[in-house]
C-alpha cells in the first residue's frame, strides 16, 4: 500500500516519559512526542510499533508525514488530530496496524491538507459514516483527500456489527459528497462480495481503484461509466466467473484505463464468448495472456486468449421429464 | 504539485540518436501514465505517445513508431524517450506531460539537428 | 485520426473582457476535450478537463463547454496574466490529437 514516506534525515527522539503526563499547552516548535522520533527537516514524525494508545496531543507544527503504524490505539475520536494551532501542513496521515476498531465521524476533522490517509490492517467494526467528511449534512465541505488507504480493514467475522461490511464502508466514501476528489481508493482484501452500485458514480475524481483479494463474484450492476479518467483496476484475486458486454464496452470506453484480472475462477463456457472475443481485441487488459480457465473441470488452465467459440459450449438443460434423481 | 525535470537541450548530428530523461517528483499522487509530446518552432503540438509506467504498456502515435522509443524506471520515478535516425524535421522541443488528460508538463527539452 | 480545429489562430481581447475560444473535432469525441494554456515562455499547463472539469489549482475564470464535436473554453474576466496561446486536445480515441493553437493578445 502506499504510505507517507520521508526522506532519511536526522531524526530527534524525545526522553521517553508517559504519554499521560504530556502538556495540553501547544507544543515548542522543536517539541517532539514521547515515544516518537522527529525530522523537521524532513517534516516527518514517526511514532512506530510504540503501543500508543491515543494520539500524541504535542504533535510539532511543522508535521507534514505522521506515520502511527504498529501501535493499540483501538478508538480514533472525533477531532484525534484538532489542535491549536492546527496542523495545517500534515499531507499523508498512515494509522495501518494500529488496532483501531472505531473510527468516530470527525475523527480527521482540522486538517486542512490531508491528502493521503492509509488506515490499513485495522479491524474496522466501526466506521462512522461521517469518519471523512466529519458532518451529517447532505452537503459537506469538500475533504482534502485524495488518496485513502483501505486495504484490510474488514474485522474478524464475530466482530462485525449485524449489518453489511461493504455497506458501511461505501456510507463513509459517499457521505456528504466530500471525497468527491479523491483520486486513489484502495480497499483490497476486505472480504468484499460486491459492489454497491452507487459507489463509482459518486467518485467522479477516481485514477486508481484497487479491489484486489476480495471476494467479488459479478460486476453486473457495477458502472464504471462515471469513472472517466480512471487509470487503473485492480481486480486480481477475486471470484469472478466472466465479465459481461455492458462492461466491456464501459471498460473499453475509458480511455485512460488499465485492467488487472489475474487469479479469477473464470468460468468458461458458452457465456465467456464475449469476454474472450473483446480480450484478444482489447489492449486494456494488463497479461491477459495469463488468464486461465478455472471450470469446468475440462477448460481448467486453458489459456483464455487460446480458445474459440467451439470450445465455449453449455451443457444442454434436460427437460425435467428426462431429468433423472 | 507533480514536478516534472527534463534533461537539458541537445545538439545532434544528422542520422544520431538522442534519450531525453522526465523525472517525476514532489507529489506521492502522480499518475502511472507518461506522455511526450513534439512542438516545432513556431508550430502547434503533436502527440507522441505515452507508456503506463507501472507495466511498460505503450501507445504510440503511428507517425512516431520507429522513431520514438518510450521506457520508464519505475523505481526512479523516471521516463525515457530515445529518438533515432535524426533529421532536421525532428529539431523541436519535446515536452513529457503526466497524466491521462496530460494533467503536468516538464519545462520542455530543445533538440536541434545540425551538421 | 481525429482532426482538431481551431478556427481562430489570434485574438485581440481588453483586460476585462470575456473571451471565448473555440474547438471543432471531425467526430464526436464524447466530451473527452481538454484544453492547455501555453505561456510565451513556453510553460504548458492545463486548465480544464472532460470538457468542463476544472483543473487543481486553475482560477474560476476559465470555465469549458460543449458536447459532440463543439467546444469551447471561455475566460470570464481576461486578465493580463492569461496572455498565452491555447491549445484544445481529444483524447477520447488515440492517437490523441491537439487543435493548432488559439493565441490570445491583448489590444
Known amino acids: 500500500s502506499s504510505s507517507p514516506t520521508s526522506s532519511a534525515s536526522s531524526f530527534s527522539s524525545s526522553a521517553p516519559f508517559l504519554a499521560s503526563a504530556v502538556s495540553a499547552q501547544p507544543p515548542l516548535p522543536d517539541q517532539c512526542p514521547a515515544l516518537c522520533e522527529c525530522s523537521e527537516a524532513a517534516r516527518t514524525v514517526k511514532c512506530v510499533n510504540r503501543n500508543l494508545t491515543e494520539v500524541p496531543t504535542d504533535l510539532p507544527a511543522y508535521v507534514r508525514n505522521l506515520f502511527l503504524t504498529g501501535n493499540q490505539l483501538a478508538v480514533l475520536p472525533a477531532g484525534a488530530f484538532a489542535r491549536r494551532p492546527p496542523l495545517a501542513e500534515l499531507a499523508a496521515l498512515n494509522l495501518s496496524g494500529s488496532r483501531l476498531d472505531e473510527v468516530r465521524a470527525g475523527a480527521f476533522e482540522h486538517l486542512p491538507s490531508l491528502r493521503q490517509l492509509d488506515l490499513s490492517h485495522n479491524p474496522l467494526a466501526d466506521l462512522s459514516p461521517f469518519a471523512f467528511s466529519g458532518s451529517n449534512a447532505s452537503v459537506s465541505a469538500p475533504s482534502p483527500l485524495v488518496e485513502l488507504i483501505l486495504n484490510h480493514i474488514v474485522p474478524p467475522e464475530d466482530e462485525r456489527q449485524n449489518r453489511s461490511f461493504e455497506g458501511m464502508v461505501v456510507a463513509a466514501l459517499l457521505a456528504g459528497r466530500a471525497l468527491q476528489g479523491l483520486r486513489r481508493l484502495e480497499l483490497a482484501s476486505n472480504h468484499f462480495l460486491y459492489l454497491p452500485r452507487d459507489v463509482l458514480a459518486q467518485l467522479p475524481s477516481l485514477r486508481h481503484l484497487d479491489l484486489s483479494n476480495n471476494s467479488l463474484v459479478s460486476l453486473t450492476y457495477v458502472s464504471f461509466r462515471n469513472l472517466t479518467h480512471l487509470e487503473s483496476l485492480h481486480l486480481e484475486d477475486n471470484a469472478l466467473k466472466v465479465l459481461h458486454n455492458g462492461t466491456l464496452a464501459e471498460l473499453q470506453g475509458l480511455p485512460h484505463i488499465r485492467v488487472f484480472l489475474d487469479n479469477n475462477p473464470w468460468v468458461c463456457d458458452c457465456h465467456m464468448a464475449d469476454m474472450v472475443t473483446w480480450l484478444k481485441e482489447t489492449e486494456v487488459v494488463q497479461g491477459k495472456d495469463r488468464l486461465t480457465c478455472a471450470y469446468p473441470e475440462k477448460m481448467r488452465n486453458r489459456v483464455l486468449l487460446e480458445l474459440n467459440s467451439a470450445d465455449l459450449d453449455c451443457d444442454p438443460i434436460l427437460p425435467p421429464s428426462l431429468q433423472t434423481s | 504539485e507533480v514536478q516534472l525535470q527534463q534533461s537539458g537541450p541537445e545538439l545532434v548530428k544528422p542520422g544520431a540518436s538522442v534519450k531525453i530523461s522526465c523525472k517525476a517528483s514532489?507529489?506521492?499522487?502522480?499518475?502511472?501514465?507518461m506522455n511526450w509530446v513534439k512542438q516545432r518552432p513556431g508550430k502547434g503540438l503533436e502527440w507522441i505517445g505515452r507508456?503506463?509506467?507501472?507495466?511498460?504498456?505503450?501507445n504510440y502515435n503511428g507517425k512516431f513508431k520507429g522513431k520514438a522509443t518510450l521506457t520508464a524506471d519505475k523505481s526512479s520515478t523516471t521516463a525515457y524517450m530515445q529518438l533515432t535516425s535524426l533529421t532536421s524535421e525532428d529539431s523541436a522541443v519535446y515536452f513529457c506531460?503526466?497524466?491521462?488528460?496530460?494533467?503536468?508538463w516538464g519545462q520542455g527539452t530543445s533538440v536541434t539537428v545540425s551538421s | 485520426d481525429i482532426q482538431m480545429t481551431q478556427s481562430t489562430s489570434s485574438l485581440s481581447a481588453s483586460l476585462g473582457d470575456r473571451v471565448t475560444i473555440s474547438c471543432r473535432a471531425s467526430?464526436?469525441?464524447?466530451?473527452?476535450l481538454n484544453w492547455y494554456q501555453q505561456k510565451p515562455d513556453g510553460t504548458v499547463k492545463l486548465l480544464i478537463y472532460?470538457?468542463?472539469r476544472l483543473h487543481s489549482g486553475v482560477p474560476s475564470r476559465f470555465s469549458g463547454s460543449g458536447s459532440g464535436t463543439d467546444y469551447s473554453l471561455t475566460i470570464s474576466n481576461l486578465e493580463q496574466e492569461d496572455i498565452a496561446t491555447y491549445f484544445c486536445?481529444?483524447?477520447?480515441?488515440?492517437?490523441?490529437?491537439f487543435g493548432g493553437g488559439t493565441k490570445l493578445e491583448i489590444k
Open positions: 506531460a503526466n497524466g491521462g488528460a496530460m494533467d503536468y
Open positions: 514532489g507529489y506521492a499522487f502522480s499518475s502511472s501514465w
Open positions: 507508456i503506463y509506467r507501472e507495466d511498460g504498456h505503450t
Open positions: 467526430q464526436d469525441i464524447s466530451n473527452y
Open positions: 472532460y470538457t468542463s
Open positions: 486536445q481529444q483524447d477520447n480515441t488515440l492517437p490523441w490529437t
